[in-house]
């Protein structure tokens, strides 16, 4: 297993609709054809997997149908979008990149993107 540098923004504020997008960029030492991207969430010392996708270079990322993540790839960059976020989902979202094929296997873990989610103010009751 060889180490690889992964860069991601330090902090992002999600939209009022609970959507957060950020770029995860990895310094690929070789010409990988198969890449796996995993998003981990760390909050209060707990780490949980949010979503993961394996893709062939030049193809779209495919997450599971019920995943809250979507993404696109361009060269050594992955554009990740996480949706359906609420205030309770605020935390550090860490991008983990694995170059699966061809060998050697490379692993890179970013420092994390602190995503803040602000629940929208409830609308005042109306008479209509």
């Amino acid at each position: 297993c060889k180490a690889m540098h992964v860069a991601q923004p330090a902090v992002v504020l999600a939209s009022s609709r609970g959507i957060a997008s950020f770029v995860c960029e990895y310094a690929s030492p070789g010409k990988a054809t198969e890449v796996r991207v995993t998003v981990l969430r760390q909050a209060d010392s707990q780490v949980t997997e949010v979503c993961a996708a394996t893709y062939m270079m030049g193809n779209e990322l495919t997450f599971l149908d019920d995943s809250i993540c979507t993404g696109t790839s361009s060269g050594n960059q992955v554009n990740l979008t996480i949706q359906g976020l609420r205030a309770m989902d605020t935390g550090l979202y860490i991008c983990k990149v694995e170059l699966m094929y061809p060998p050697p296997y490379y692993l890179g873990i970013g420092n994390g993107t602190q995503i803040y989610v602000i629940d929208p103010e409830p609308c005042p009751d109306s008479d209509f």
Partner: antibody
Framework: QVQLVQSGAEVKKPGASVKVSCKAS????????ISWVRQAPGQGLEWMGW????????NYAQKLQGRVTMTTDTSTSTAYMELRSLRSDDTAVYYC?????????WGQGTLVTVSS | EIVLTQSPATLSLSPGERATLSCGAS???????LAWYQQKPGLAPRLLIY???TRATGIPDRFSGSGSGTDFTLTISRLEPEDFAVYYC?????????FGQGTKVEIK
């Protein structure tokens, strides 16, 4: 090294607007947030809000909502805070700071005096 | 809005003594997202602690933070002359983010 340099002191009349700038250097501007905090003379710190320089999304203190606007110019790595309809109790030192989880780097502060 | 109440308002101690500052929240602070700042007259605040217990870069280990939920503490194990200042807590776990009113640590 990381530096945040704010614009100079301002004297404004009640009802006017003020726009304070905060120029960042020494780091990747769009990777961080900019938080704004003010401090009235002899008083404590008051959080005003923050902006994500990555996407421009903002979160304002409710008491300032409608009067405050925070923006960034990523081409010059500068953040701006505009406060409208100024009142005498807006007299304060206004600070910007680089935000992730706490403000680790601060500007030097901008004194805004509101007086007729 | 979470109200942070700092106590005591003023702490009179001598250099070398231990200082214990409290910050109580009106409701639980999510993810232990609480920071402590030090401020000296005429200067911008300085971040000491974030995430309730993580020391910021370059902060001496005599400063430590602890707590969760609604009760947080900043401890200065042995006061140095340069530690006499005003200390603020700030929560950023629940919007709107808020500061406490401050605790002044003065020389006895």
């Amino acid at each position: 090294q990381v530096q945040l340099v704010q614009s100079g002191a301002e004297v404004k009349k009640p009802g006017a607007s003020v726009k304070v700038s905060c120029k960042a250097s020494g780091y990747t501007f769009t990777s961080y947030g900019i938080s704004w905090v003010r401090q009235a003379p002899g008083q404590g710190l008051e959080w005003m809000g923050w902006i994500s320089a990555y996407n421009g999304n903002t979160n304002y203190a409710q008491k300032l909502q409608g009067r405050v606007t925070m923006t960034t110019d990523t081409s010059t790595s500068t953040a701006y805070m505009e406060l409208r309809s100024l009142r005498s109790d807006d007299t304060a030192v206004y600070y910007c700071g680089r935000w992730v989880r706490g403000v680790e780097y601060w500007g030097q502060g901008t004194l805004v005096t509101v007086s007729s | 809005e979470i109200v942070l109440t700092q106590s005591p308002a003023t702490l009179s101690l001598s250099p070398g003594e231990r200082a214990t500052l409290s910050c109580g929240a009106s409701q639980s602070v999510n993810n232990r997202y609480l920071a402590w700042y030090q401020q000296k007259p005429g200067l911008a605040p300085r971040l000491l602690i974030y995430d309730a217990s993580t020391r910021a870069t370059g902060i001496p280990d005599r400063f430590s933070g602890s707590g969760s939920g609604t009760d947080f503490t900043l401890t200065i194990s042995r006061l140095e002359p340069e530690d006499f200042a005003v200390y603020y807590c700030q929560q950023y776990g629940n919007s709107p983010w808020t500061f406490g009113q401050g605790t002044k640590v003065e020389i006895k």
